[in-house]
């Protein structure tokens, strides 16, 4: 039968962060072409990326609808090309992918301090309210928008002039900590679902210290 | 039985407003894509779009983008393509066919569309 | 887009006789369907995937190709397969036919 040289795809893989969602997938086709279909448990198989030479499959658009759904994904392989013989195929192979419920378990990407803003002994802390892909009345929603009280944020920060870190956390994206008075502080913020079980926490974000550009500083 | 039965021949003046239906039967209609092709007197085939029913996700040939307009009615399982003002150029047989892969090949049996003054 | 050439654009040739039908792409292409109409007919699946046999063609039809260049062959003309021939590539958006190729009795 013409399917007598596809095979079907393995090790199905979803790739999500601040749900961009991409389903990966082996083997680099020869001979043949993928056509990718996704579902909720309840609803109908639909097909994306058509007969495609990739082995990736970005289905953002079709996550996004409902975050908190669970899908199944399953990737066709269909001959294209030299197999060995010509005819009737029968149905075509396809995997299975793992079901995945985007948010439970995207990635949550790094995240950036936008500003820190010194008066005195206090420093307040801003982290930037990354934008995702999730859509509500034709607007973008922030990763705060969508995860509302789940998602907290821990600071760390440390005088520059030593290592002993210390830590703050709070369930908006801003952070109001005391600081001695002439010192320099270098701050990291990670981004963390505590009611999670996987991917819980993002990687830090990237140091930023008093005395740069991104702080203003007003001495009182 | 997969069947595609389409709307009867349409003879329009330029101008005027026209939509043609496809109804599917025999198979779950929102599961699969629907797609629309032209063809021009005495012309080869041309892709023009298609639709997914479920949830009107469309994917269209730019070429076609501000000429027509492709929409669904899942409650009575018919996909449509329609015109708000049409030109003589418009003139052909439009079918449509559910996306299939491989040997599964369902088409509509046409809908013949003359515009002329 | 991916722009589909035919040739020839009409073959003319007698029953028992090999035809062989081109079609070209302007870029490349991994996946090819081939068509057959007739007048006042739908058109119909004939070759899809390349080479792949649609249900009921019989073994006398042939496809091949990579890359840019494809061909349906029928290896002995028979009388019911007198008619318009149409390649299609589902390899990137938007999907393009080539302008047919019309085989006719000599």
């Known amino acids: 039968s013409g399917t007598t040289n596809t095979v079907a795809a393995y090790n199905l893989t979803w790739k999500s962060t601040n749900f961009k969602t991409i389903l990966e997938w082996e083997p680099k086709p020869v001979n043949q072409v993928y056509t990718v279909q996704i579902s909720t448990k309840s609803g109908d198989w639909k097909s994306k990326c058509f007969y495609t030479t990739d082995t990736e499959c970005d289905l953002t658009d079709e996550i996004v609808k409902d975050v908190k759904q669970t899908y199944l994904a399953r990737v066709f392989s269909y001959p294209a090309g030299n197999v060995e013989s010509t005819g009737s195929a029968g149905e075509p192979l396809y995997e299975n992918s793992p079901e995945f419920t985007p948010y439970l378990e995207t990635n949550l990407g790094q995240p950036t301090i936008q500003s820190f803003e010194q008066v005195g002994t206090k420093v307040n802390v801003t982290v930037e309210d990354e934008r995702t892909l999730v859509r509500r009345n034709n607007t973008f929603l922030s990763l705060r928008d969508v995860f509302g009280k789940d998602l907290i944020y821990t600071l760390y920060y440390w005088k520059s002039s030593s290592s002993g870190k210390k830590t703050a956390k709070t369930n908006t994206n801003e952070f109001l900590i005391d600081v001695d008075k002439g010192e320099n502080y270098c701050f990291s913020v990670q981004a963390v679902i505590p009611s999670r079980t996987v991917n819980r926490k993002s990687t830090d974000s990237p140091v930023e210290c008093m005395g740069q550009e991104k702080g203003e500083f007003r001495e009182i | 039985e997969v069947q595609l039965v389409q709307s009867g021949a349409e003879v329009k003046k330029p101008g005027e407003s026209l939509k043609i239906s496809c109804k599917g039967s025999g198979y779950s209609f929102t599961s699969y894509w629907m797609n629309w092709v032209r063809q021009m007197p005495g012309k080869g085939l041309e892709w023009m779009g298609m639709i997914y029913p479920a949830d009107s996700e469309t994917r269209l040939n730019q070429k076609f983008k501000d000429q027509a307009t492709l929409s669904v009615d899942k409650s009575i399982s018919t996909a449509y393509l329609q015109w708000s003002s049409l030109k003589a150029s418009d003139t052909a047989m439009y079918y449509c066919?559910?996306?299939?892969?491989?040997?599964?090949?369902?088409w509509g049996q046409g809908t013949t569309v003359t515009v002329s003054s | 887009e991916i722009v589909l050439t035919q040739s020839p654009a009409t073959l003319s040739l007698s029953p028992g006789e090999r035809a062989t039908l081109s079609c070209s792409a302007s870029?490349?292409?991994?996946?090819m369907n081939w068509y057959q109409q007739k007048p006042g007919q739908a058109p119909r699946i004939w070759i899809y995937g390349i080479s792949n046999l649609a249900s009921g063609i019989p073994a006398r039809f042939s496809g091949s190709g990579s890359g840019t260049d494809f061909t349906l062959t029928i290896s002995s003309l028979e009388p019911e397969d007198f008619a318009v021939y149409y390649c299609?590539?589902?390899?990137?958006?938007?999907?393009?036919f080539g302008g047919g190729t019309k085989v006719e009795i000599k």
């Open positions: 870029s490349s292409v991994s996946y």
């Open positions: 299609q590539q589902k390899s990137s958006f938007p999907w393009t």
């Open positions: 066919a559910r996306e299939d892969y491989g040997s599964s090949d369902y």
